[in-house]
């Protein structure tokens, strides 16, 4: 039960006090007791429950009431059973007793009121009225946890607007309200109660820019809302009528958790005594609700795909046809960004990452817009954000970004368990340098801070600065699997490729050509690739870089070797010793459920079939996966990217609720 106020009683004159239902009120009977009195007894109206803690009672009086010694060891507390119909309608009488004097009486007139701030603290999607209880003031994780949840109202329900809903202080319509969390103030008081008392709703100054609260005002024609708390307004006096009354508020978050904001927002209603005009208002009671802002959550390749995004650029019609066919097979919606909108920027994966936010009453996809800001920079905000599709961005919007700030360098693992630590929503993966140096690249600190602050997908830093482009999607991917952990980690593997080519040479296929069918490309014989010592040295270096990540991933994701599949791939070191794929990078694939869109490697044709394609199929088809090899050579590969780099996917949110985990 919540703590109420302290009431001091005195025999000199009656005391008037307010007692809020659900609170425990302390009664000070000692400090004003007559000097020659040594004990006291208590009589109450039926609506008041008094509890006296002292062991043992002094003596039982014949009337049935007990007396207790007046000493500091006595604790008197009272609670009320029901709200008062009129002011002071409940009475407590304290009788002080002494050896030589008749009893002296002190009177306390109590007004019982019900004042409670309620929200969906049980996370059921419904607001249940709660009396003032301690639990509302804390937010706890886990299946038995409690505490309300707020969504950042980061979608754009008004198609005419260019701004997010949370950027204005208006409620568009009932759709906009659904993005907010309901909070209800319940009051039950005597009719004249608010002539002498006032309620004020408030938020800490440090949190006022993170939240906006609308009060629903029931008009004759429609429900209208007005802002009562927000970035410019940390408190608001409420006009509450006497009697029984419910007041609804709609709460929206304005900011995601981040470095200086753990995501918790406390809204408090304070009851003030304003009866003495010549004195300042005094706080009689407070009730609070704590909300946590829902984190932005990424979805791994193992989640079912719902929508595929791709760019239309000069001469990529065949690529588009292949992606369209794959999306149809996977029963996905397809969104094509036309040339006039992408400004010759085909790297859809790099521009954005689509995740979601979730409260018990609502789930919303949210696009995280990278700060890379090239030709596609308007696409997330103009074409992706919209009604029930949110938007967030971080990092410098002008300059100061590196290649590692593109979201080909941002992936997430499927759910994993590492030792006895569970990651039911997986872990975020991004690439970094091995150590900071004058020219090393890393993901911008603002992006790293944002990702860490979401708490539910603890990030893992991988090493990717060894690559020309520097993205993790150049050496790893995840695919769904029917067994073990429900997925496999795919890693690009020069070792596996050399092994395959050596086997082919041993079988007499040393003259088979890589890049057959590619115009204006020097075709390479298997035997020449195997005998090129420089290329071998380069791939030995690449293998070491990938192996470093392999061990890191095994440790941080709790993987065994049998959870990993090596995809044959060669790299070459280019300027400044940065690596890029020697032939189309097969691990850079589009995963749509069981349907995989894999860059066509143009490997050596042996017995009428590309030996690289054959090898990859033999590794992935036993998992029930269907491999489609997409020709991206001229339009993507020679421009330092592949199928995954050129596409993006919105996936189904996890069925697991983020608040049920313990970060």
């Amino acid at each position: 039960m919540a703590q109420g106020t302290l009431i001091r009683v005195t025999p000199e004159q009656p005391t008037h006090a307010v007692c809020v239902l659900g609170t425990l009120t302390q009664l000070d009977v000692c400090s004003s007791a007559p000097e020659d009195c040594t004990s006291f007894s208590v009589n109450t109206s039926p609506g008041v429950v008094v509890d006296i803690a002292h062991s043992p009672p002094a003596k039982k009086k014949s009337t049935g009431s007990s007396t207790w010694p007046l000493d500091p060891g006595v604790e008197v507390t009272l609670t009320m059973k029901a709200a008062s119909g009129s002011t002071g309608d409940q009475k407590v009488q304290i009788s002080y007793h002494g050896p030589k004097t008749p009893p002296v009486k002190a009177l306390l007139y109590l007004t019982g009121v019900e004042i409670s701030l309620s929200a969906d603290i049980t996370r059921t999607g419904k607001v249940k009225p709660t009396r003032a209880v301690e639990d509302k003031r804390t937010w706890t994780w886990g299946p038995c946890g409690q505490g309300a949840i707020l969504l950042v109202n980061c979608d754009r329900d008004n198609p005419e607007s260019s701004a997010m809903d949370c950027e204005d202080d208006e409620v568009l319509d009932s759709k906009d309200l659904k993005d907010m969390s309901l909070m209800t103030l319940s009051t039950k008081t005597p009719q004249d109660f608010f002539t002498r008392h006032t309620l004020v709703l408030h938020v800490a100054r440090s949190e006022m820019d993170k939240v906006r609260v609308f009060q629903a005002t029931r008009g004759r024609l429609s429900s209208r809302c007005r802002v009562v708390l927000g970035p410019k307004q940390p408190s608001h006096y409420l006009m509450v009528p006497g009697g029984k009354h419910n007041m609804d508020f709609y709460v929206e978050a304005l900011a995601f958790p981040d470095t200086n904001f753990p995501g918790l927002i406390t809204l408090t209603v304070s009851m003030l005594d304003t009866s003495k005009l010549e004195l300042p208002e005094a706080v009689v009671f407070q009730d609070s609700v704590v909300f946590r802002v829902a984190p932005w959550i990424m979805t791994p390749n193992t989640q079912p795909p719902q929508e595929v995004y791709v760019c239309s650029i000069f001469e990529n019609e065949d690529f588009l046809k292949s992606v369209t066919a794959l999306a149809m097979q996977a029963r996905c919606k397809l969104t094509i960004c036309p040339e006039e909108e992408n400004m010759d920027d085909q790297w859809m994966q790099d521009e954005m990452e689509i995740g979601y936010i979730q409260a018990p009453h609502k789930t919303l996809p949210v696009v995280f817009d990278s700060p890379r800001n090239r030709g596609l920079k308007e696409f997330p905000i103009k074409r992706v954000m919209g009604p029930d599709f949110g938007y967030v961005t971080r990092g410098p919007q002008t300059g100061g970004v590196s290649g590692l700030d593109s979201f080909g360098n941002l992936e997430v693992s499927p759910p994993v368990t590492v030792g006895d630590k569970e990651y039911p929503l997986g872990r975020i993966l991004f690439g970094d340098s091995c150590y900071p140096s004058s020219d090393s690249r890393e993901m911008h600190q603002a992006l790293q801070d944002f990702l860490s602050a979401q708490q539910v997908q603890a990030p893992v830093k991988l090493y990717s600065d060894w690559l020309t482009v520097g993205h993790v999607d150049e050496f790893l991917s995840f695919v769904p699997a029917p067994d073990r952990k429900g997925f496999r980690l795919l890693l690009a593997s020069p070792r596996s490729c050399y092994k395959l080519f050596q086997e082919q040479q041993n079988e007499g296929h040393g003259d088979a050509l890589l890049f057959q069918g590619i115009k204006k490309k020097n075709q390479q014989k298997i035997k020449n690739i195997l005998s090129n010592t420089t290329l071998r040295e380069h791939n030995s270096f690449v293998e070491r870089c990938i192996d470093w990540n392999r061990e890191l991933l095994k440790r941080e994701l709790g993987l065994a070797e049998s959870d990993i599949i090596d995809i044959p791939q060669l790299f070459k070191l280019k300027e400044f010793s940065k690596a890029e794929a020697f032939f189309p990078n097969m691990v850079n694939m589009l995963v749509l459920g069981k349907h995989l869109g894999i860059p066509k490697p143009f490997g050596p044709i042996i017995n009428g079939r590309c030996c690289l394609e054959e090898k990859v199929c033999s590794l992935l088809e036993p998992l029930g996966l269907h491999c489609t090899f997409i020709n991206d050579f001229y339009t993507y590969h020679i421009r330092h990217g592949e199928v995954h780099c050129g596409t993006n996917v919105r996936r189904k949110p996890f069925s697991f609720k983020w608040w049920n985990m313990v970060p």
Epitope: T468, T534, L535, F576, H640
Partner: antibody, heavy 128, light 111 residues
Framework: QVQLVESGGGLVKPGGSLRLSCAAS????????VSWIRQAPGKGLEWVSF????????YYADSVRGRFTISRDNAKNTVYLQMNSLRAEDTAVYYC?????????????????????WGRGTLVTVSS | QSALTQPRSVSGSPGQSVTISCTGT?????????VSWYQQHPGKAPKLIIY???ERPSGVPDRFSGSKSGNTASLTISGLQAEDEADYYC???????????FGGGTKLTVL
């Protein structure tokens, strides 16, 4: 063959800023590595900065790191050198140069380290 | 003070050969085969004449040749001609924090 033209030079006070542009014609600049090299009056060549064709990494000379930023806009076929906190010793003719990033090379050809095509240069004078 | 050391000047008569040296360290010339040479006439932009130690871009006469031994690279111009009079700069990739270094330049005078 690509042709390069630098612009944006001029007189600037110490502590000031300038943005140099290197516009390409005759070919798509996105296929080229681009470097900036400068030459103080009567002095030798000094390598300043580099950006790769994929626009994914940059390098700088110790003398300019933290003050200069190289960037490219492939749609505009232009590379930029943003120069902040300029000093008297930055006075020089600034040349833009490029080398083709040939995807056909089987191993590193070193094209990022030599300058195949040069512009005519633009003079930057830093003086109070 | 340039990172790569070149003689300030060399001279030769028409038809003769001259060699310009470029001395670096084990971290640049000695480590990489990414040495290039540039010719610069007064008031003009430099022109690439040798790359990757000894390779010549198309259009550069075969009188120009490059070589390397240890930490020193050399440019040899045989059959000197009057139009060869210019400043010559060597350059190398380096593993230092400035990844491309130039020499201080050598003034070639054709007597």
């Amino acid at each position: 063959q690509v042709q390069l033209v630098e612009s944006g030079g001029g007189l600037v006070k110490p502590g000031g800023s300038l943005r140099l542009s290197c516009a390409a014609s005759g070919s798509t600049l996105s296929d080229y590595f681009v470097s900036w090299i400068r030459q103080a009056p009567g002095k030798g060549l000094e390598w300043v900065s580099f950006i790769n064709s994929a626009n994914t990494f940059t390098y700088y000379a110790d003398s300019v790191r933290g003050r200069f930023t190289i960037s490219r806009d492939n749609a505009k076929n232009t590379v930029y050198l943003q120069m902040n906190s300029l000093r008297a010793e930055d006075t020089a003719v600034y040349y833009c140069s490029s080398a083709n990033d040939d995807v056909d090379d089987i191993v590193a050809p070193g094209r990022g380290y030599y300058m195949d095509v040069w512009g005519r240069g633009t003079l930057v004078t830093v003086s109070s | 003070q340039s990172a790569l050391t070149q003689p300030r000047s060399v001279s030769g008569s028409p038809g003769q050969s001259v060699t310009i040296s470029c001395t670096g360290t084990r971290g640049d010339v000695g480590r990489y085969n990414h040495v290039s040479w540039y010719q610069q006439h007064p008031g003009k932009a430099p022109k690439l004449i040798i790359y990757n130690v000894y390779e010549r871009p198309s259009g550069v006469p075969d009188r120009f040749s490059g070589s390397k031994s240890g930490n020193t690279a050399s440019l040899t111009i045989s059959g000197l001609q009057a139009e060869d009079e210019a400043d010559y700069y060597c350059s190398s990739h380096s593993r230092s924090s400035t990844p491309v270094l130039f020499g201080g330049g050598t003034k070639l005078t054709v007597l």
